[in-house]
């Protein structure tokens, strides 16, 4: 699922879309004097049998209230760079933030973008003159539209749509993990974990200082850059004297296994090499740091195992939410299964099944997840993100419902709300198995494929499969067509 | 105006060497990787070589493997393909390719030179 | 290595009719919501000329009845309407590991 162009060529600007309707950026209206009201999560559970009516009522009340609004309309993400120009991206220049303000909030959404890792000199060079973007803010645009999770729309965001938005681009290709500034012996700047430090510490400057929650957030390496870098976060939070901000977590498409590949190749560039091989090179050239707890676990040379989140995550002090696909497609392709709509082997469709009851274990223990069973690939900044569901419920529902369960106290309880819930983990074993999964185009004619289809597409044996699962079948194909 | 400019072809003998040159012009030479392509009479491109940016990488297609050298001089703005061991399946229009920085993609090509391997 | 199977070798396209072009990568060329795929046209005698880049992008001064879709390892080039000048060979290309690589061909020939 290829995601929207935010970039264009040599810095030019995408064509910027109309204006929406005129909504205001928040419902609450600003006091004159003093603190700024609070502005509380949407409960939903009240509304549930008629959320549409619910939520137009929402834009109603929005509409008439934008006139009090001082600030006009803007969906976009403002760039600044950082004052501190010694936190750099890999070639030297300054690295950044895309921020929005939401005075009325006192919740910031920090997210960390991703786009893999390079991990030698060779690669890191290629990465540079094809993919400078991730490497340089020479070129970066002033302004970013905020999707998915980062949108101001209640509609596709029903989460936290009011919140504080700050986008971090993934500028140091060290899965976030770096400190490590260029040199005369380093042609290459690694410094992902500081950039998150000193993005930290300007925004105290911009209003942070008076936020109630802070939810680092990430997708891909970005997902792997908030098990890395959440403890820390709160920590820098607590020595600068704002131990009262909750930092949380919310890493999604990072939680990847240290598995064995399909088929074995040589790690000579990011997507071919194995998990481990890739972050044991790679955290030696990053120089890179991983959380202190779990660095203790593991003798010198082993702190690799730290970005693996299922050894990361007992480690973590600050709640942290997990999504992951369970059958991701990054995870696939370091694993060498590559799907390009040739039917697959039984071997390889052995795997991909093995994979996900492995994810599915590692999940196991975590309180907080979301993970259903699809073939893809990131979701919280897809605009889709409202869609997909894990037993009736979608990803913003639980993450509300995980909001929720911190009202009591400041650990997130054990036991979820009653019609609550936000330990969703997919049971079904085939991806895509889960009919709200994002939709699958045939590769060849574009047209949808239903689960049926697809599976039958990637050389699915009905037959066998239902001998397996003891069935018809007739019966097996129905099941898979209603998606149970 | 961008502009590439190959030079440095001609006829060879099998064994023999050849140094082709790519002189660039109308843009920071420093910024860009650079590529070789090669093209067979009546047949389709083949990729042949990388040079980064730095000039600190090279990478080379199997087939040419430890027969070509390619470097280049950011100072002067040039692209250098040094060939050994010719053989007649080297016969071809060599371009040299300016390589977008945010794709990969070949923006810029030169005319080309042709290369002949010929007893 | 990613191999790039193109198709059809040649095809002949009536004026002013769609000409597609499909480009299959042997494993998928899309990282981080973009893909690695570019085309190319070729004419007798001149070097390769961008058309599209990252699957869909339209080169500048490319004019728009030249369309390029796709992701993952599945990528199209479409030309509609098809015009005399539209008479060449086409490629595709992949930029995402090295080596890059480029597809076989196609050649078009106006009816």
């Known amino acids: 699922s290829e995601g929207r162009k935010t970039w264009r060529r040599r810095g030019q600007q995408p064509p910027q879309p109309p204006p929406p309707p005129p909504l205001p950026q928040r419902a609450e209206v600003e006091p004159g004097a003093g603190q700024p009201v609070e502005s509380f999560p949407l409960d939903f559970t009240a509304v549930e049998g008629n959320m549409d009516s619910f939520m137009a009522q929402v834009k109603s009340l929005a509409q008439s209230l934008y006139p009090c609004s001082a600030q006009q309309l803007n969906e976009d993400l403002r760039l600044h760079l950082l004052l501190n120009t010694s936190v750099t991206c890999n070639d030297g220049s300054p690295a950044g933030y895309y921020l929005k303000e939401s005075k009325g909030s006192r919740r910031w959404l920090l997210f960390l973008e991703g786009g893999w890792y390079c991990f030698n000199r060779e690669n890191c060079d290629s990465r540079y003159d094809t993919m400078r973007r991730l490497m340089s803010s020479k070129d970066w645009p002033h302004t970013r539209t905020g999707t998915g999770i980062l949108s101001s729309q209640p509609e596709e965001n029903p989460h936290w749509w009011n919140a504080n938005m700050v986008f971090i681009p993934y500028c140091s290709s060290d899965v976030w993990s770096g400190a490590s500034p260029k040199s005369d012996k380093n042609e290459y700047a690694f410094m992902g974990s500081l950039i998150i430090q000193e993005v930290v510490r300007e925004l105290l400057g911009k209003g942070l200082s008076g936020a109630k929650v802070l939810l680092l957030a990430g997708s891909s390496a970005g997902g792997t850059g908030v098990l890395l870098n959440v403890d820390r976060v709160a920590e820098l939070l607590e020595e600068l004297g704002y131990p009262s901000i909750q930092v949380r977590g919310l890493a999604d498409s990072g939680w990847f296994l240290d598995n064995k590949q399909y088929r074995r190749s040589d790690c000579i560039d990011t997507i071919n090499c194995a998990p481990t091989d890739a972050i044991r090179r790679g955290i030696r050239y990053w120089s890179g740091m991983v959380p202190e707890r779990c660095q203790r676990q593991f003798k010198e040379g082993e702190e690799w195992n730290c970005f693996f989140g299922y050894k990361v995550y007992p480690t973590l002090r600050c709640p942290v939410f997990v999504v992951q696909w369970l059958f991701d497609e990054a995870q696939l392709t370091v694993d060498n299964v590559h799907l390009t709509g040739q039917p697959v082997q039984e071997g390889q469709w052995l795997y991909i099944q093995n994979l996900g009851r492995e994810l599915r274990g590692t999940l196991k223990d975590v309180q907080a997840s979301f993970a259903p069973a699809c073939l893809s690939h990131e979701i919280i900044i897809r605009s889709y993100w409202t869609d997909v569901q894990v037993k009736g419920t979608s990803l913003p529902r639980a993450l509300h419902c995980w909001d929720r369960s911190f009202h009591d106290s400041h650990k997130a309880s054990k036991t979820p709300m009653k019609g609550c819930p936000f330990h969703l983990v997919d049971s079904c074993p085939w991806p895509h198995c889960n009919p709200s999964c994002p939709t699958i185009r045939d590769q060849f004619t574009g047209q949808e494929m239903n689960v049926a289809q697809f599976l039958m597409h990637m050389g699915f044996d009905v037959q066998t499969v239902a001998q397996q699962q003891g069935m018809e079948p007739s019966k097996l194909l129905g099941m898979l067509s209603n998606g149970n | 105006d961008v502009q590439l400019l190959e030079s440095g072809g001609g006829l060879v003998q099998p064994g023999g060497s050849r140094k082709l040159s790519c002189a660039a012009s109308?843009?920071?030479?420093?910024?860009?990787?650079m590529h070789w392509v090669r093209q067979a009479p009546e047949k389709g491109l083949e990729w042949v070589a990388y040079?980064?940016?730095?000039?600190?990488?090279?990478y080379y297609a199997d087939t040419v493997k430890g027969r070509l050298t390619l470097s280049r001089d950011n100072s002067k703005n040039t692209l250098f393909l040094e060939m050994t061991s010719l053989r007649s399946e080297d016969t071809a229009m060599y371009y040299c390719?300016?390589?977008?920085?945010?794709?990969?993609?070949?923006?810029?090509w030169g005319q080309g030179t042709s290369l002949t391997v010929s007893s | 290595d990613i191999v790039l199977t193109q198709s059809p070798a040649s095809l002949a396209v009536s004026l002013g009719q769609r000409a597609t072009i499909s480009c299959r990568a042997s494993?998928?060329?899309?990282?981080?919501?973009?893909?690695?795929i570019h085309w190319y046209q070729q004419k007798p005698g001149q070097p390769p000329k961008l058309l599209i880049y990252?699957?869909?992008d339209l080169e500048s001064g490319v004019p728009a009845r030249f369309s390029g879709s796709g992701s993952g390892a599945a990528f199209t080039l479409n030309i509609h309407p098809v015009e005399e000048e539209d008479a060449a060979t086409y490629y595709c290309?992949?930029?995402?590991?090295?080596?890059?690589?480029f597809g076989s061909g196609t050649k078009l020939e106006i009816k």
């Open positions: 494993k998928s060329v899309s990282t981080s919501g973009y893909s690695y």
């Open positions: 109308g843009f920071t030479f420093s910024d860009f990787g």
């Open positions: 040079s980064s940016s730095g000039g600190t990488t090279v």
């Open positions: 990252l699957a869909s």
């Open positions: 390719a300016r390589a977008s920085y945010d794709g990969g993609y070949f923006d810029c």
């Open positions: 290309h992949h930029s995402r590991e090295l080596p890059f690589t």
